[in-house]
């Protein structure tokens, strides 16, 4: 049957019917339902929510809804032995202790099982020593400390402010610098927007608020004990000493009231420049150690958290395709939260719930999508993207043969200013065309398209008249699908104004104050931004699952490949002498990119002209489009990161959240002037150029005429 025969409404009306069925009021109701108690991964509460979602998705009309479970390594504080940090005097007496919990928000005082702030997967330990302030603990911050200021962090406890980069990268950098412990804190400069009140009177972080989060460096491995394979009942598990990505030094997060107490006594070197100074009334001295009369005082960490293998549950719903049931379009977002999950993840889960309900309504009226749609409620995302990764590992053979696209659905909002999209270039045209058809929810843009308000508020830095679309990095559940399996992926959410709000993430991220009321009172009272995000995510899924020809444009990959080749070449040309000495040439890569450009244009011409009524031809062309993303996968993976296999994109080695283009070449070039053996280092650059060249050329060939 053709797609239109599988339905009693015409295709154009289907999309409209689907979008019209999405209701802000329902999203609001679902968000409220999902945020009344904590849903920490591995807990009974989160298992119950999984069963509730399973039951409701069945009611909504999906063909099947299953729970899939895995036994993965999770981490929890010791309930009887709390984690804290103290300042101790020369006699070893604790003269200051950090708080043991966040003051709960009004109305939530009697809620049980609020996990106190902790850094998940921190080892146990009670290191003591002098403090060194390391700014954001980025690679460049440690370069400044060690190379310019000649400050040695070896044997020291470092204190770093949250923001700019993924916290796991901060911990890794501190470990490499020889630190014995890490204290993470939220500086008001990053988590307190000027002119806005603290929660519960506004959306700013109070002094007692703390950001939880995992501090792993998994590099896409999933469960630390079963890298590459699902954590099922017969899985072989590594010992803790061989586990992937675990930190080796104790780590603990604190709020800015407690940080003030630690930082106000700091002595030693002054901060190198204003970029190292936050908004607290402290000198932001780097240390090491406390000043003058406090110089005999030390800092001591008391960390007693435990890591244990725990059962987690994904919910997987299926809406079978009428024409191509063996082609999967996946919409997935996580369900587990640190506490109430008012934004992360339940603002996303509520949107997924409403999308499922709308698809279910269409199905009940006799419609089916052309391709199969899979809906997923992932568990243990907060503990390292574990639920999605284990499921993808278990189903990797099916996914790499049948996976058309993955749309991520974590937090729907991180602000209420404009749209934010990260996706594969294959989806650029899909996103642009869809947003031109949707109405903007923004004030001052009544009757205008979402595309128009998005372009005005977030213009592309390179291409005028178009909105910005960013590269996919990681830190969310699309990682395994895109970076490991090469399935075309995208994500969309409403965001803040990055020009005027310099704070990192949103202030109450991963704190106890991330509640339903936060969203309902301050971010989206009418739930209009949630509705818009539902329309974008749902619209993308609809088009990917229902359009006769896949809505991918390979020409847009050609455009970005040219841009990325130019960029990496310009980076390498900062070393013209070495390029000459070691005969480093990018000619082959530029040639491959040109070939890709030419073949992509010819493919697009064939795509326009071929007989769409011929099912074999149609399937052939669609398969070439589906497998293009897959063609960028190197089965050997990136150096020391075997689960990051995409040659064009990978999470930055210095910030998991950010995407890097031509990551193999980029990493080979990074800090190359400091390498002990330049000949070997430039040899690796050449090797990476050859891998990139081969991959781009091979991807181009997949678009050539098949015979």
């Amino acid at each position: 049957k053709s797609s239109s025969e599988a339905t009693n409404i015409t295709p154009k009306h289907n999309m409209k019917a689907f979008l019209d069925e999405l209701k802000a009021e329902n999203i609001k109701k679902f968000l409220h339902n999902f945020t009344q108690i904590p849903h920490l991964a591995g807990t009974e509460q989160n298992f119950q929510l999984a069963k509730q979602i399973q039951s409701q998705w069945k009611e909504f009309g999906l063909d099947s809804v299953e729970l899939t479970h895995y036994d993965v390594l999770l981490s929890y504080p010791n309930k009887t032995h709390p984690n804290y940090i103290s300042i101790i005097n020369e006699d070893g007496n604790e003269i200051f202790n950090t708080s043991l919990f966040e003051p709960p928000p009004a109305g939530y005082e009697n809620v049980s099982d609020i996990v106190p702030p902790f850094s998940a997967f921190s080892p146990q330990g009670m290191p003591e020593g002098d403090l060194v302030y390391v700014n954001y603990a980025r690679t460049e911050d440690f370069f400044k400390l060690e190379r310019d200021m000649k400050i040695n962090c070896s044997g020291k406890i470092v204190i770093a402010r949250y923001g700019k980069v993924f916290r796991g990268n901060k911990v890794k950098n501190a470990q490499l610098a020889g630190a014995t412990g890490v204290i993470l804190y939220s500086d008001p400069d990053d988590y307190f927007a000027p002119g806005v009140k603290s929660y519960p009177d506004g959306w700013n972080l109070p002094g007692g608020g703390v950001q939880r989060g995992n501090i792993l460096n998994l590099n896409g491995a999933g469960d630390p004990l079963t890298p590459g394979y699902p954590a099922n009942e017969y899985a072989y598990r590594r010992g803790m000493a061989e586990a992937v990505g675990l930190p080796s030094i104790p780590v603990h997060p604190i709020g800015y009231y407690d940080a003030q107490k630690l930082l106000e006594k700091m002595g030693g070197s002054a901060s190198p420049d204003s970029s190292w100074r936050g908004s607290l009334k402290v000198p932001y001295n780097v240390g090491p150690g406390f000043t003058g009369n406090f110089s005999t005082q030390k800092v001591k960490m008391h960390i007693h958290s435990t890591s244990e293998v725990t059962r987690i549950y994904n919910v997987i719903g299926t809406l079978r395709g009428a024409v191509e049931p063996d082609r999967y379009v996946i919409l997935g977002g996580h369900r587990d939260s640190w506490v109430f999950g008012g934004i992360d993840p339940q603002s996303g889960a509520a949107v997924v719930h409403e999308i499922v309900r709308s698809f279910g309504m269409l199905k009940k009226e006799g419609w089916r999508p052309r391709r199969t749609i899979l809906f997923a409620s992932w568990d243990a995302e907060e503990f390292g993207l574990l639920g999605s990764t284990e499921w993808a590992e278990e189903n990797s053979r099916l996914l790499q043969e049948r996976g058309v696209a993955y749309i991520n659905a974590d937090s729907s909002i991180e602000g209420n200013y404009t749209l934010r999209v990260d996706c594969t270039p294959l989806m650029y045209s899909l996103v642009y065309n869809l947003t031109k058809e949707l109405e903007s929810p923004d004030e001052g843009f009544e009757g205008k398209s979402l595309y128009e308000s998005w372009t005005k508020k977030s213009p592309s830095p390179e291409f005028s008249g178009m909105p910005r679309i960013s590269k996919l990095g990681s830190g969310n559940d699309f990682e395994v699908f895109f970076q490991r399996l090469g399935i075309a992926s995208g994500r969309a959410r409403y965001t803040k104004n990055w020009e005027t709000n310099k704070f990192s993430s949103y202030p109450l991220y991963h704190s106890v104050y991330e509640t339903y009321e936060l969203v309902e009172k301050f971010y989206d009272p009418m739930f209009k931004y949630h509705l818009t995000v539902a329309q974008v995510r749902g619209g993308m899924v609809f088009e990917l699952a229902n359009s006769v020809v896949l809505p991918f444009d390979c020409r847009d990959y050609a455009v970005v490949l040219r841009k990325y080749a130019d960029k990496i070449y310009n980076i390498s040309m900062k070393h013209p002498q070495e390029m000459k000495t070691y005969s480093v040439s990018f000619d082959s890569l530029f040639s491959a990119v040109k070939n890709f450009t030419e073949i992509a244009s010819k493919f697009s011409e064939r795509l326009r002209d071929f007989d769409k009524s011929n099912p074999i031809l149609l399937r052939m062309m669609n398969d070439q489009l589906m497998f293009l993303e897959r063609a960028f996968i190197d089965p050997l993976g990136l150096p020391d990161r075997p689960f990051y296999r995409h040659v064009i994109y990978a999470p930055s080695s210095h910030n998991k959240y950010a995407g890097e283009s031509f990551p193999g070449i980029y990493d080979a070039l990074f800090d190359i002037e400091s390498k002990v053996d330049p000949s070997q280092a430039w040899g690796e650059v050449k090797r990476q150029i050859s891998i990139a060249t081969f991959t781009v050329q091979a991807a181009a060939e997949t678009l050539s005429e098949v015979a």
């Epitope: 020409r555 050609a558 455009v559 130019d566 040309m573 990018f586 992509a600 697009s604």
Partner: antibody, heavy 121, light 111 residues
Framework: EVQLVESGGGLVQPGGSLRLSCAAS????????MSWVRQAPGKGLEWVSA????????YYADSVKGRFTISRDNSKNTLWLQMNSLRAEDTAVYYC??????????????WGQGTLVTVSS | QSVLTQPPSVSAAPGQKVTISCSGS????????VSWYQQLPGTAPKLLIY???KRPSGIPDRFSGSKSGTSATLGITGLQTGDEADYYC???????????FGGGTKLTVLG
Amino acid sequence: EVQLVESGGGLVQPGGSLRLSCAASGFTFSSYAMSWVRQAPGKGLEWVSAISGGIGSTYYADSVKGRFTISRDNSKNTLWLQMNSLRAEDTAVYYCAKDGVGATPYYFDYWGQGTLVTVSS
Amino acid sequence: QSVLTQPPSVSAAPGQKVTISCSGSSSNIGINYVSWYQQLPGTAPKLLIYDNNKRPSGIPDRFSGSKSGTSATLGITGLQTGDEADYYCGTWDSSLSAVVFGGGTKLTVLG
């Protein structure tokens, strides 16, 4: 046979605006980058702007950035150049040119006959 | 001032050979493909050479192109009076993200 026909040139005062069009035929318009190249009287060629195939990413010469906007309508096989805040030094014959490779600019295998823009008070 | 440097003029007698140089930098000619265009008086430019050394169909093999390092050269053998024109080199510049041209070379066929 590939054809590119420019139109919309003329006399305009400094500070004024003009919109040039280029009607394309004989090839799959949407798959190729398109450029505007100009030539001041008695001078050499100067690339002005390009727009990629596909979604239409745009590129501009520094001399026109912020003043000129390139756009295309693939359904109409038409390329445009909106020129605002025109200056005397923008006086030139403006050529529309098709890329010979694909979605980004490499070389120009076909050129239009040109349209003259005169900026003068 | 053009990004690519060409001699303003060259001349030779009919039947002779002439070369026109085009000098750039590592970010343009050094890494990208060079094309050459012929502009006869009063007409639009015409593609003569692309991808450093390839000729479009219809361009006689008297015209040739080469590239070495950050320079490119257009060669014309068996000069004819009909070759009298302006010649431009062009390429992409990876630092500027822009197409760049040479200032043009006026070829005069003597006699």
